[in-house]
């Protein structure tokens, strides 16, 4: 099979193919104006249009604008990718009452359970808090939910759980209009009893649940709201999210309210010098020396080859599992045969520094 022979001439004479020395394989040449979705395309569907930044290629092959999460009540759930839109959701402490494609048209604050009711299900980005009547065993002095303990599993609720209705608690479901802090503050004062993290059913230590609006007096569970592209670090400071704007980096996780953006080396590259939430230096994937492969003859590939039938015999040059750990049967400095195909197959985490040993084989840098 031509694809299994490392000979360049097998691809020549066909204008729709080219030879990639790095993977020792014939590749499909994407037509003008189309870009490969993997290092060595194998067919026309491995090519795609390239859209402008902040646009994605939809199912009809059109470049479509990614939605923006710039409204105060929204946060980015997933970033804008080449083939999918950015997805926004209501920020912590709020839920979506009117959904929109890849976003939410209207977010409301989670309701507080009224006196005599306790949280059955805490509010999420999609659903409001669900309350249920406190059990008969609970003290009638339990006037506000934050003082009430959840009933033990042995108690039977008196009625079916019900979400707090906006009709009965209009103040508690006040929508947040883009950027009006007064509305947020008003909503905050109306809907939150002092020190009431349990009103949404979680302990106050959970940072994902603290309200994002300014604190009412006496409330200890609020957090600062940072500027766009900043996050609240563990010390409670607004810290700039790292930027992945360098050509050799791609965004791995977006900038969130409580965590930085993280960057990784783009497919086909590996991190040589790590940095906090990023990589200071990306280098092209090291290619395994041909002599380190168990069966070099009749091979066009760099990844593991198996000889039939005994499975499990590992060649010298072998990718580690996807979590980057070496198999138990091998030594920690086992050489890695790196496959430079799609980013999902990288055998070494791209944030892990790699050093080349004296044999020319890459080894994980423990430092």
């Amino acid at each position: 099979f031509p694809q299994d022979r490392p000979f360049e001439d097998t691809c020549h004479g066909n204008p729709s193919h080219y030879y990639d020395k790095a993977v020792r394989r014939c590749c499909y040449r994407c037509p003008m104006g189309l870009f490969p979705t993997q290092q060595c395309p194998q067919r026309p569907t491995d090519c795609r249009k390239q859209c402008e930044p902040d646009y994605y290629l939809d199912e009809a092959d059109r470049c479509t604008a990614c939605v923006t999460c710039s409204r105060d009540d929204l946060v980015e759930k997933t970033p804008c990718a080449w083939n999918s839109s950015r997805v926004c959701e209501c920020r912590p402490g709020m839920f979506c009452s009117t959904s929109a494609v890849n976003s939410c048209a209207r977010c409301f604050f989670h309701s507080v359970c009224p006196a005599g009711m306790i949280v059955k299900f805490p509010g999420t980005a999609q659903k409001n808090t669900v309350c249920e009547p406190a059990s008969p065993g609970v003290s009638p002095a339990c006037a506000s939910p934050e003082n009430c303990k959840e009933p033990s599993s042995g108690t039977i609720p008196q009625a079916k759980p019900t979400p707090v209705s906006p009709a009965t608690s209009s103040a508690s479901t006040m929508p947040v209009r883009g950027g009006t802090r007064l509305a947020q503050e008003a909503a905050s004062k109306l809907t939150r009893a002092p020190d009431s993290p349990s009103s949404v059913g979680r302990p106050s230590s959970d940072p994902g649940l603290s309200p994002t609006q300014p604190c009412p007096e006496g409330s200890g569970d609020c957090r600062k709201q940072c500027e766009p592209d900043y996050y609240l670090d563990e010390a409670g400071r607004c810290t700039a999210c790292v930027s992945c704007s360098r050509d050799d980096l791609v965004e791995k996780t977006p900038c969130a309210w409580n965590s930085s953006r993280t960057c990784e080396c783009r497919p086909g590259m590996i991190c040589a010098t790590s940095a906090t939430n990023s990589c200071a230096r990306c280098v092209p994937y090291p290619i395994c020396a041909a002599e380190t492969v168990t069966k070099p003859q009749d091979m066009a590939e760099k990844d593991t080859t198996f000889e039939a039938p005994p499975l499990g015999t590992q060649p010298d040059c072998n990718p580690t599992p996807e979590n980057g750990e070496a198999p138990a049967s091998t030594s920690p400095t086992q050489s890695l045969l790196v496959d430079s195909q799609a980013s999902k197959t990288l055998p070494i985490p791209t944030s892990a520094p790699v050093a080349l040993s004296s044999t020319g084989k890459p080894v994980l840098d423990a430092g």
Partner: antibody, heavy 116, light 107 residues
Framework: QVQLQQWGAGLLKPSETLSLTCAVY????????WSWIRQPPGKGLEWIGE???????KYTPSLKSRVTISVDTSKHQFSLKLSSVTAADTAVYYC??????????WGRGTLVTVSS | EIVLTQSPATLSLSPGERATLSCRAS??????LAWYQQKPGQAPRLLIY???NRATGIPARLSGSGSGTDFTLTISSLEPEDFAVYYC?????????FGQGTKVEIK
């Protein structure tokens, strides 16, 4: 020499799940697409679906609700599961590799018979 | 999905004769078409890819032509080993589809 070896149950009862596995020996696994194709007795070929080394799948619409293709890259294997089989699923099932040269490498085929 | 229609269904010829097999697509597939040969009890074998390129080891008497919707596989002079079923296959649009086949039999 690169080879595809496939195996799985050959006789099934209606409503059972067909399960086949294909192993790649002597060649690369990543960077290619791995398909399942079937051929009812005396009839033509039907592409069922594919997977790549990173687990990305595509299925033919007529079977999409019943078919699952999975991959085990560490073993260089990929598998087909087809649920709720009927007599119409009786066929020779082939695994195949797709490259720039289309389906350039095929397994020998496994006859799966669905009969009560 | 793209439907590939092969004609004729059966072609009865003698060794040494010329065989012309047709494959028509319901919509354009550009040149993203392959031809396969299948003998009884065997898996299909790739003959032609990208409409007109012979696969490795395929003799020069087999040739492919066409683009868009009309494709032809030609066997210039039939050898005994050429009597088999031939399928065309497209990979221009999901799902990949095959023609129903043309059987080339000895007259």
């Amino acid at each position: 020499q690169v080879q595809l070896q496939q195996w799985g149950a050959g006789l099934l009862k209606p409503s059972e799940t067909l399960s086949l596995t294909c192993a790649v020996y002597g060649g690369s696994f990543s960077g290619y697409y791995w398909s399942w194709i079937r051929q009812p007795p005396g009839k033509g070929l039907e592409w069922i679906g594919e997977i790549n080394h990173s687990g990305s799948t595509k299925y033919t619409p007529s079977l999409k609700s019943r078919v699952t293709i999975s991959v085990d890259t560490s073993k260089h294997q990929f598998s087909l599961k087809l649920s709720s089989v009927t007599a119409a699923d009786t066929a020779v099932y082939y695994c195949a590799r797709e490259t720039v040269y289309y389906f350039d490498l095929w397994g020998r085929g496994t006859l799966v018979t669905v009969s009560s | 999905e793209i439907v590939l229609t092969q004609s004729p269904a059966t072609l009865s010829l003698s060794p040494g004769e010329r065989a012309t097999l047709s494959c028509r697509a319901s919509q354009s597939v550009s040149s993203n078409l392959a031809w396969y040969q299948q003998k009884p009890g065997q898996a299909p074998r790739l003959l032609i890819y990208d409409a007109s390129n012979r696969a490795t080891g395929i003799p020069a008497r087999l040739s492919g032509s066409g683009s868009g919707t009309d494709f032809t596989l030609t066997i210039s002079s039939l050898e005994p080993e050429d009597f088999a079923v031939y399928y065309c296959q497209q990979r221009s649009n999901w799902p990949w589809t095959f023609g129903q086949g043309t059987k080339v039999e000895i007259k």
